[in-house]
């Protein structure tokens, strides 16, 4: 060995400078008499090496790093050999931090596998290996004096949290318990803790379990859940409280905790809860009144909530048929009577006669908003309730009564847009209860059992804006009939457009006769169409060679027009304009020519 | 200092019935779970049942399954076997225990004989 | 159920002896083993429970091991008032099963 490093440290804190003497052994003879020593750190040549020759031949040369900045390097003592640099010797040098004090040190006790995990954090990177050790000891007292000391728990490399086994624990005793961090810089201790392995017990979760339905047991309330809870086995000697979490499966909703419960539920009852929805229920306990940790959250037990019977008032509306007027067509709308008014399955019709309790005859039963039946002569009166599997709603009467009300007069309509229209009346005397209001398509398209219906509760309404099934170009029929305590008014009828369409087309011009001065024109008129206005009027346009335009409004009936004042020999554009409320259409240019000074007339 | 007193054995004809009484102190009755253990003459120890602190859990083994009902009074710190149906083989000194947080019955009576015989 | 297995079912040693008595669960219980020692007319008191903790006012000459299915109560030192029966028991579940008891009697 030619040369030999030696370092005032190998391992420094980083950023602190750093001393290394190289020296050269006389008997290198190969060596230049006078070599000069380099230095280079990785692969920078460091400048700054003082040089000498000692007193026994040998050749030294010190070099102070002033900062050390690199977590690892690696220091060269060189010579210039030829075109190359020899590295005589090489040390390594490493810089990094004493450890900090771990933080945040807690532990827990696993009954099952009986033993005392305690974890930390470490803090921040040291950039040198840095060994952590879990230290504790057995404590009679509040850990002031120190009793057995337990064998040290060393981490595998790179985890921050030990397991003290079950051989080292005494349960309801006190130990000391810290982490001590130690690498070449220094070593440092987290604060101690002091506990009993039983006051940090972290439990298993109970397992949800749904109530199996007993005969005897009444099924649970609407928006309730019946369920209970398995406790673990091993913990079921430890007093515990425990709380329960819920949420609808569907939706964005978070958790709502109810607690505390005990941890033996033979059975509960969770209600308030929506109806008819599925939740997601899962549990967790902790170790109570003494002290502990809470256990996870058990798996989740998914349930569905029973629906409630509807609540809803049902708005009802009939017609008989004008054949057979035993034959009656019942319409009928839901109307929510609470936020949820729980969900319908169906509809039932029925009747009972009179004379025979307990005897309830079906109509109908339908998922649909009407239904058609044949009414026993006897029955003046059906019930009809919506239901679900939870129930039915109350009855709604429906009295099939003579129409003896008042009247009310004055029905109109107008549109409002094109996709409403307002009907309006002058109430009869006395007030009716409310109305009834019908509307679909006027001839030739009317059909009855297209007809949407809408119930006006307020009798001293004097009109309904209509927004439902409205299109624009379209003739609606509007029947509006008042409805008295125990029968109704004649119904009132009026028809009317949200919107008309301008004419479609304008009628062809045809020439009847030609003069030098003057041209007869005439038309055939379009047929009227449904969904248009009827014309208000035409403008007939006519412009010469010299581009000047001329017009003439005529009335709706006209047929023809004879165009005065032309010149002769001369050529003109005349086009026809139909025109009604909703706007107006030209129809296709005539171009004709007067005839010449000497010419005859034409007829 | 716990102590158990066990009350309520004695002599008693097959198909009778008895009632066992434990009195509890010198601890939180309300918070431990208790049960009762019997060991027939020159026999080992059987476990016979065992009540959770406020009542609502109740194991029982299954030779007095149907037959006895354990149950408690928190007010009164006082535990009770109720024994019907009894048999020849139910007769056993019949230990009061107190169990601790991990199942072990950690203080023990003095026991109370219970002989059936006609 | 959980069947404990004690054993032996007797032994006979003298004062300063290591005693050593096996428990064996039919199935794993963790730690759940408690060991007892009962006198001829008195009940039973706790030595020993969750396998290997000291019951307070028990003397350290008594000592617990083993876990999952395999249990040993040792004496380190036989005493004269140690001549007695011992008992294991489950608490991992219920049934609580006691094992079929240990007599140490004097050589």
């Known amino acids: 060995e030619c040369g030999h490093i030696s370092v005032s440290a190998p391992i420094v804190h980083l950023g602190d400078p750093i001393t290394a003497s190289c020296i050269i052994k006389q008997n290198c003879s190969h060596l230049d008499p006078e070599p000069q020593i380099l230095w280079r750190l990785g692969a920078e040549l460091q400048p700054g090496g003082r040089q000498q020759r000692l007193s026994d031949g040998t050749q030294e040369s010190i070099i102070t790093l002033p900062h050390l900045n690199h977590t690892q390097a690696f220091l060269s003592c060189c010579l210039n050999w030829g075109n190359s640099l020899q590295i005589l010797d090489q040390v390594e040098l490493r810089a990094g931090y004493p450890p900090a004090i771990p933080h945040n040190l807690s532990c827990l006790m696993n009954l099952t596998t009986s033993s005392l995990i305690c974890q930390w954090e470490p803090g921040p990177e040291t950039h040198l290996p840095t060994s952590f050790t879990l230290k504790s000891f057995k404590s009679r007292g509040n850990c002031q004096t120190q009793g057995d000391s337990i064998l040290d728990c060393v981490p595998k490399d790179g985890q921050s949290h030990c397991c003290i086994p079950r051989k080292h624990l005494l349960l309801y005793q006190n130990m000391g318990i810290w982490v001590q961090a130690e690498n070449a810089l220094g070593t440092s201790m987290s604060p101690q803790l002091c506990l009993d392995p039983m006051d940090v017990v972290k439990l298993e979760p109970p397992m949800l379990r749904t109530m199996d339905p007993s005969p005897e047991a009444a099924p649970p309330q609407a928006g309730c859940l019946q369920l209970c809870w398995e406790p673990w086995q091993p913990g079921l000697h430890i007093n515990q409280k425990c709380e329960l979490r819920h949420k609808p499966q569907r939706g964005e909703a978070s958790w709502a905790l109810v607690g505390p419960l005990p941890l033996e539920a033979l059975q509960y009852e969770l209600c308030g809860l929506l109806p008819a929805t599925a939740y997601t229920l899962q549990i967790r306990c902790i170790r109570w009144p003494l002290p502990g940790h809470w256990s996870d959250w058990s798996p989740s037990l998914e349930l569905r909530t029973t629906e409630r019977a509807p609540t809803v008032r049902l708005d009802t509306w009939w017609r008989q048929r004008q054949l057979d007027p035993r034959t009656v067509q019942l319409f009928w709308k839901p109307v929510p009577l609470e936020e949820d008014s729980g969900r319908i399955q169906g509809y039932v019709v029925s009747w009972r006669p009179s004379g025979q309790a307990g005897a309830i005859l079906p109509l109908c039963n339908t998922t649909e908003l009407s239904c058609t039946f044949h009414l026993p002569s006897e029955a003046q009166e059906v019930a009809l309730v919506a239901y679900n599997s939870a129930g039915t709603s109350r009855p709604t009467p429906v009295v099939f009564s003579e129409s003896r009300g008042p009247a009310l007069t004055r029905l109109h309509a107008m549109a409002r847009d094109p996709h409403s229209l307002w009907v309006g009346w002058e109430p009869p005397n006395p007030w009716p209860q409310g109305y009834v209001i019908e509307w679909g398509l006027g001839p030739p398209s009317a059909s009855n059992s297209n007809k949407t219906w809408r119930m006006e509760q307020n009798g001293r309404a004097t009109g309904f804006l209509l927004k439902e099934n409205i299109r624009p170009f379209q003739l609606y029929e509007i029947i509006v009939t008042p409805l008295y305590q125990d029968t109704m008014g004649p119904s009132q009828h009026v028809y009317a457009y949200s919107q008309e369409m301008a004419p479609s087309h304008a009628p062809e011009l045809h020439l009847k006769h030609i003069g030098k001065t003057w041209a007869q024109l005439e038309w055939v008129p379009e047929p009227p169409e449904l969904g248009k206005s009827p014309l208000t009027h035409y403008t007939i346009f006519w412009t010469n060679a010299q581009n000047q335009s001329f017009s003439a409004i005529l009335n709706a009936s006209s047929r023809g027009f004879v165009l005065h004042g032309l010149e002769p020999a001369s050529l003109y554009h005349i086009h026809l304009m139909a025109a009604s409320q909703a706007g107006a259409t030209n129809s296709t240019v005539l171009t004709l020519m007067t005839l010449t000074p000497e010419g005859s007339e034409l007829h | 200092e716990v102590q158990l007193l066990e009350s309520g054995g004695g002599l008693v004809q097959p198909g009778g019935s008895l009632r066992l009484s434990c009195a509890a102190s010198?601890?939180?009755?309300?918070?431990?779970?208790m049960g009762w253990v019997r060991q027939a003459p020159g026999k080992g120890l059987e476990w016979v049942s065992s009540?959770?602190?406020?009542?609502?859990?109740?194991p029982y083994a299954d030779s007095v399954k149907g037959r006895f009902t354990i149950s408690r009074d928190n007010s009164k710190n006082t535990l009770y076997l109720q024994m019907n149906s009894l048999r020849a083989e139910d007769t056993a000194v019949y230990y009061c225990?107190?169990?601790?947080?991990?199942?072990?019955?950690?203080?023990w009576g003095q026991g109370t004989l219970v002989t059936v015989s006609s | 159920d959980i069947q404990m297995t004690q054993s032996p079912s007797s032994l006979s040693a003298s004062v300063g002896d290591r005693v050593t008595i096996t428990c064996r669960a039919s199935?794993?219980?963790?730690?759940?083993l408690n060991w007892y020692q009962q006198k001829p007319g008195k009940a039973p008191k706790l030595l020993i429970y969750?396998?290997?903790n000291l019951q307070n006012g028990v003397p350290s000459r008594f000592s617990g091991s083993g876990s999952g299915t395999d249990f040993t109560l040792t004496i380190s030192s036989l005493q004269p008032e140690d001549f007695a029966t011992y008992y294991c028991?489950?608490?991992?579940?219920?049934?609580?099963?006691f094992g079929g008891g240990t007599k140490v009697e004097i050589k």
């Open positions: 010198g601890f939180t009755f309300s918070l431990y779970w």
């Open positions: 969750y396998a290997s």
């Open positions: 225990a107190k169990l601790g947080e991990l199942g072990q019955s950690s203080a």
């Open positions: 199935q794993g219980i963790s730690s759940y």
């Open positions: 009540i959770s602190s406020s009542g609502g859990v109740t």
């Open positions: 028991q489950q608490s991992i579940q219920y049934p609580q099963m």
